[in-house]
Interface confidence: low
C-alpha cells in the first residue's frame, strides 16, 4: 500500500481542516488508514482522524481544531496499521479556505432593485469575520449564456443591482462565495443557490 498523491490540507480558520490524498489502488480508507496530527511545540498525544473514502483510491479526513492562530503548525503522520506511509506538516494559516456564506436571500420588493443578502460564515471574534470579500454568481435557468459574476469588495454581506439589468419574466439563480485577501486564501465553496422569478415594469416608451 502506497500513497500516490500526498495529502494536501486546507483550514477553515475556525474549527476544521480538511486533508485529501490518493492511494495507489482502491482502499477502504476508514478501516485501513489513520491520520495522526499534532500541534508543534505545544503537543499532547496525537489526535487521530479516521478518513473517509473520496472516490475509489481517494481519501479525505476532517481534522478537528477548536481554534487556530497564525503561529500554529501541525505535524501529520499517515499510518496503515503499524506502517508509516507519509509524514508531513501543515500550517493552517497558510492554507485557508473560508467557510461558505449562508442564508442567501433575494429581496425583490425594493422598487425595481434586487437586494441580495447573505450571512458571514464566521463569528465576530474570528479574525476572518472582518476580512471577507465575496463574489456573487447570478445565472439564468433558461439561457446558459446569461451568466454573470459580481465582486463584492466591501465588508457588508449584501449586493444591490437594478432588476432591469436582468431579463424580465424569467427565473434566475444566485449563489455566493468568499475569500480573504489577508491570508491569500482560496475561494470558499459556493453557497447553496437560491431561485427567484425576475419581473419588473418596463418604463413607458417615449414617443
Amino acid at each position: 500500500m502506497k500513497v500516490l498523491q500526498e495529502p494536501t490540507c486546507v483550514s477553515d480558520y475556525m474549527s476544521i481542516s480538511t486533508c485529501e490524498w490518493k492511494m495507489n489502488g482502491p482502499t477502504n480508507c476508514s478501516t485501513e488508514l489513520r491520520l495522526l496530527y499534532q500541534l508543534v511545540f505545544l503537543l499532547s498525544e496525537a489526535h487521530t482522524c479516521i478518513p473517509e473514502n473520496n472516490g475509489g483510491a481517494g481519501c479525505v479526513c476532517h481534522l478537528l481544531m477548536d481554534d487556530v492562530v497564525s503561529a500554529d503548525n501541525y505535524t501529520l503522520d499517515l499510518w496503515a496499521g503499524q506502517q508509516l506511509l507519509w509524514k508531513g506538516s501543515f500550517k493552517p494559516s497558510e492554507h485557508v479556505k473560508p467557510r461558505a456564506p449562508g442564508n442567501l436571500t433575494v429581496h425583490t420588493n425594493v422598487s425595481d432593485t434586487l437586494l441580495l443578502t447573505w450571512s458571514n460564515p464566521y463569528p465576530p471574534d474570528n479574525y476572518l469575520y472582518n476580512h471577507l470579500t465575496y463574489a456573487v454568481n447570478i445565472w439564468s435557468e433558461n439561457d446558459p449564456a446569461d451568466f454573470r459574476i459580481y465582486n463584492v469588495t466591501y465588508l457588508e454581506p449584501s449586493l444591490r443591482i437594478a432588476a432591469s439589468t436582468l431579463k424580465s419574466g424569467i427565473s434566475y439563480r444566485a449563489r455566493v462565495r468568499a475569500w480573504a485577501q489577508c491570508y491569500n486564501t482560496t475561494w470558499s465553496e459556493w453557497s447553496p443557490s437560491t431561485k427567484w422569478h425576475n419581473s419588473y415594469r418596463e418604463p413607458f416608451e417615449q414617443h
Epitope: L39, F41, L42, L43, S44, M65, V69
Partner: antibody
C-alpha cells in the same frame, strides 16, 4: 496532583553558566509541552522557552536565544534549562510551567513550580 | 512581538467593591488572552483563558471579556484574598507575552 519542583538556582558571575532542573510528577510528563517563565525581582512575568512533548522542537524568547537551551528527559520526568553567557538582566526567579490543554494547544499555564532564584552578579 | 499594556498600574479598592482591570494588545490577539493572579512569594495562578473562560476552581466573581485588542478582567465583589497582582498573557503569536501587571491593593 501535579507537582513541579525546580532546582539549580544560585549566585553566578556574569558570563558563567548554570543549569536548572524541574522534576515533574502527578501527570503524564511525556505527553505535555513544557515551558520556562521567569520573573525579575519586583518585576513582571517573562516567557523564556518552550519544548514539545518529545523534545524535538524548542522555541525561545529573543532575549535568551542562542544563550539558553531547553531540554527534557522523559525517562526521568525532568525538564532542564541550560543557561550560558549569563548577564545581570537574567537575574530572576525561574518557574517551570506545565501548560493546560485547551483545544489541543498548550499555551495557558495551569501548573507552576515554586520557582528557583538565579542571581547573576560579580 | 505583541505588547500587552495593562491599566491601571495600581488599583486601590475596599473589600466588597468591584474591580475592573484592563489589558490592551498592540495588535489583535482575537480571543487568545489569559489572566493570572499572583500573590507575594507565590507562583502565578491561572484565572481566565480564551478571554472569558474560567479555569478549574476559579470563583464566579472573576469574569473576563473582550476580543481583538481590548480585554477586561472584572472581580464583581472583592474578597480579602483577591488583593494581589494580576497579569494578562497572549498566545496569538510567538513569542508568548505578558502584560506588566495591575496591583489590586486595599484602600
Amino acid at each position: 496532583q501535579v507537582q513541579l519542583v525546580e532546582s539549580g538556582g544560585g549566585v553566578v558571575q556574569p558570563g558563567r553558566s548554570l543549569r536548572l532542573s524541574c522534576a515533574a510528577s502527578g501527570f503524564t510528563f511525556s505527553s505535555n509541552g513544557m515551558h520556562w517563565v521567569r520573573q525579575a525581582p519586583g518585576k513582571g512575568l517573562e516567557w523564556v522557552a518552550v519544548i514539545s512533548y518529545d523534545g524535538n522542537n524548542q522555541y525561545y524568547a529573543d532575549s535568551v536565544k542562542g544563550r539558553f537551551t531547553i531540554s527534557r528527559d522523559n525517562s526521568k520526568n525532568t525538564l532542564y534549562l541550560q543557561m550560558n553567557s549569563l548577564r545581570a538582566e537574567d537575574t530572576a526567579v525561574y518557574y517551570c510551567t506545565k501548560a493546560i490543554s485547551i483545544s489541543g494547544t498548550y499555551n495557558w499555564f495551569d501548573s507552576w513550580g515554586q520557582g528557583t532564584l538565579v542571581t547573576v552578579s560579580s | 512581538e505583541i505588547v500587552l499594556t495593562q491599566s491601571p498600574a495600581t488599583l486601590s479598592l475596599s473589600p466588597g467593591e468591584r474591580a475592573t482591570l484592563s489589558c490592551r494588545a498592540s495588535q489583535s490577539v482575537s480571543r487568545y488572552l489569559a489572566w493570572y493572579q499572583q500573590k507575594p512569594g507565590q507562583a502565578p495562578r491561572l484565572l481566565i483563558y480564551d478571554a472569558s473562560n474560567r479555569a478549574t476552581g476559579i470563583p464566579a466573581r472573576f469574569s473576563g471579556s473582550g476580543s481583538g485588542t481590548d480585554f477586561t478582567l472584572t472581580i464583581s465583589s472583592l474578597e480579602p484574598e483577591d488583593f494581589a497582582v494580576y497579569y494578562c498573557q497572549q498566545r496569538s503569536n510567538w513569542p508568548l507575552t505578558f502584560g506588566g501587571g495591575t496591583k489590586v491593593e486595599i484602600k
